[in-house]
Amino acid sequence: LVITPPGPEFVLNISSTFVLTCSGSAPVMWEQMSQVPWQEAAMNQDGTFSSVLTLTNVTGGDTGEYFCVYNNSLGPELSERKRIYIFVPDPTMGFLPMDSEDLFIFVTDVTETTIPCRVTDPQLEVTLHEKKVDIPLHVPYDHQRGFTGTFEDKTYICKTTIGDREVDSDTYYVYSLQVSSINVSVNAVQTVVRQGESITIRCIVMGNDVVNFQWTYPRMKSGRLVEPVTDYLFGVPSRIGSILHIPTAELSDSGTYTCNVSVSVNDHGDEKAINISVIENGYVRLLETLGDVEIAELHRSRTLRVVFEAYPMPSVLWLKDNRTLGDSGAGELVLSTRNMSETRYVSELILVRVKVSEAGYYTMRAFHEDDEVQLSFKLQVNVPVRVLELSESHPANGEQTIRCRGRGMPQPNVTWSTCRDLKRCPRKLSPTPLGNSSKEESQLETNVTFWEEDQEYEVVSTLRLRHVDQPLSVRCMLQNSMGGDSQEVTVVPHSLPFKV
């Protein structure tokens, strides 16, 4: 790249016009403060490219650095950039304006940093002060960049004199961050291995400096050294990795593996550690189990979840009534086992829109060549109560018999109630539950049957009314944890010629 006039620094008169030309072997352009100002690009007769930047009617605000760069940085040979700096002395402008974020300067460790207060005139004398103290600090000043040095956590201002007036800059705030200059990460292919398996630990550091990797590991104690493989990692940003590999682990290889990365031999740098467990045999252990009886509701979906810890990864089987379950094509059943962490797993059986036929005895088995666990439970499918029949009969002895039959799971409870005022019953008058009346008036008999094939209970309750002297509304109500159902019948005395 060639800049004309060559610079590297120009001092322009205010309101003047200035022309800069940059030439190169590929298309070029001018940049100013990461912006691309208006410019004229051209291809020359000799095959070179140029761009002309014309600064017209310049002000102090035009003070700053200008870069000529290749338009499209294709490869390292075109990453070259040329810099020039322009001053436009402007007595009306003190310090060049700063973005508010540039007033906060964060420093890591004890590194040099720059307080970037700049003026438009390179002849001006500029001093740096702690804001609270008026004594100038002895820090080198570069009119193009500002004050560069090592600064404490304080507030600073820059001062200059233009004509006969003293001008102060904005306040700069310096904060030091205690951050290591090296960013190290360590991970292992597996942190749990069986004896005889391999251990592989990877240590990665950001940056492209020449760094020293120092590993410490349990084998070192017995003088058996492992040669790590250290290399750059492909891609950008640049990183360097070191891999420690032990092909055949022993129980004594359990312990802490530390990767220490330093820039120089006497520098502590940064280190990260990881714990490795070498075990004699694999294992499977249940962490979260299910109850002896698990409940599902008819036509609702139900997830049965088992959490276990294992190494190596086990095979998992779910069985129902000792028959192996598999994902159903119809989507009624979904089986999945997934990693929660390196050695922790969750296995789920999802029953979609549960059917009565899915009630039964379930088992989950998790196993590998070293160990196995199993977990069994009964799945109960709860079915809402239905009153299937409410009938009335008149035996010859003058009694009135009302029979109520219903089904549900779990076992329904039966409640009988009566109401004598038919006009107001049941909306305006609560029915009277039976049970308080004397034995002579009514007799109740309830039988319960469990139907194995339907996996639900059937309740048959018979109410015998000895004497009915006026029309009576009788309600049979069945209830379980899934809800309730009821039916009513109106019973009339024998003497009345009709029933309502």
Epitope: G75, P76, S79, T200, R202, I204, N208, D209, V210, V229, D231, Y232, L233, F234, G235, V236, S238, R239, I240, G241, I243, H245, P247
Partner: antibody
């Protein structure tokens, strides 16, 4: 001894695709960066693609970027280079390499000719 | 990476081949004939594979890597490539090669 054996070269048609495989032996394959370097007739060495051991990160040479894919199978100790949309200028001997910052082992090479 | 296109050395003499423009590490590779497999002579500036004769050595000073062959032999006639990691690209680049002629 460290050996790197390439396969998959031969006569290819422009616009077609190429798949080269390199099998490593005699070393812990999973611990090493692997890659491909090529040499066109009468020319120098040119980096094609690389894949890191530590995190499977990849890099591609400018001439093949966007057309190449490199992958590795540590279980099989193999590294594969897939190169699509072949051009005449892809004609070269392709070498499998071990290493990133410095190459410490080379395969014998497999010749690829792209011609109609 | 910049390296001389050719150098010559007397049989039994010493020759140095330089490479500049790289970063932290240089490697040196010998190729006896075009298309034949290169052989790594030096990696990481000065490390020599166990099967490489001790007459080949590597060093780095500043940003320049140097391959030194002491006691040059007739079979050392070959093209020598330098390689170095390129941070901006994220991979290693190569020099154009130096042809060694043994006189």
């Amino acid at each position: 001894a460290v050996t790197l054996d390439e396969s998959g070269g031969g006569l290819q048609t422009p616009g077609g695709a190429l798949s080269l495989v390199c099998k490593g032996s005699g070393f812990t394959f999973s611990s090493y960066n692997m890659g491909w370097v090529r040499q066109a007739p009468g020319k120098g060495l040119e980096f094609v693609a690389g894949i890191s051991a530590a995190d499977n990160s990849t890099a591609y040479g400018a001439a093949v970027d966007g057309r190449a894919t490199i992958s590795r199978d540590n279980g099989q100790s193999t590294v594969r280079l897939q190169l699509n949309n072949l051009r005449a200028e892809d004609t070269a001997t392709y070498f499998c390499i071990r290493g990133g910052g410095s190459i410490d082992a080379w395969g014998h090479g497999t010749e690829v000719i792209v011609s109609s | 990476l910049t390296q001389p296109s050719s150098v010559s050395a007397n049989l039994g003499g010493t020759v140095k081949i330089t490479c500049s423009g790289g970063g932290s590490y240089y490697g040196w590779y010998q190729q006896k004939s075009p298309g034949s497999a290169p052989v790594t002579l030096i990696y990481y500036n000065d490390k020599r594979p166990s099967d490489i004769p001790s007459r080949f050595s590597g060093s780095k000073s500043g940003s320049t890597g140097t391959l030194t062959i002491t006691g040059v032999q007739a079979e050392d006639e070959a093209v020598y490539f330098c390689g170095a990691w390129d941070n901006s690209a994220g991979y290693a680049g190569f020099g154009a090669g130096t042809t060694l002629t043994v006189l």
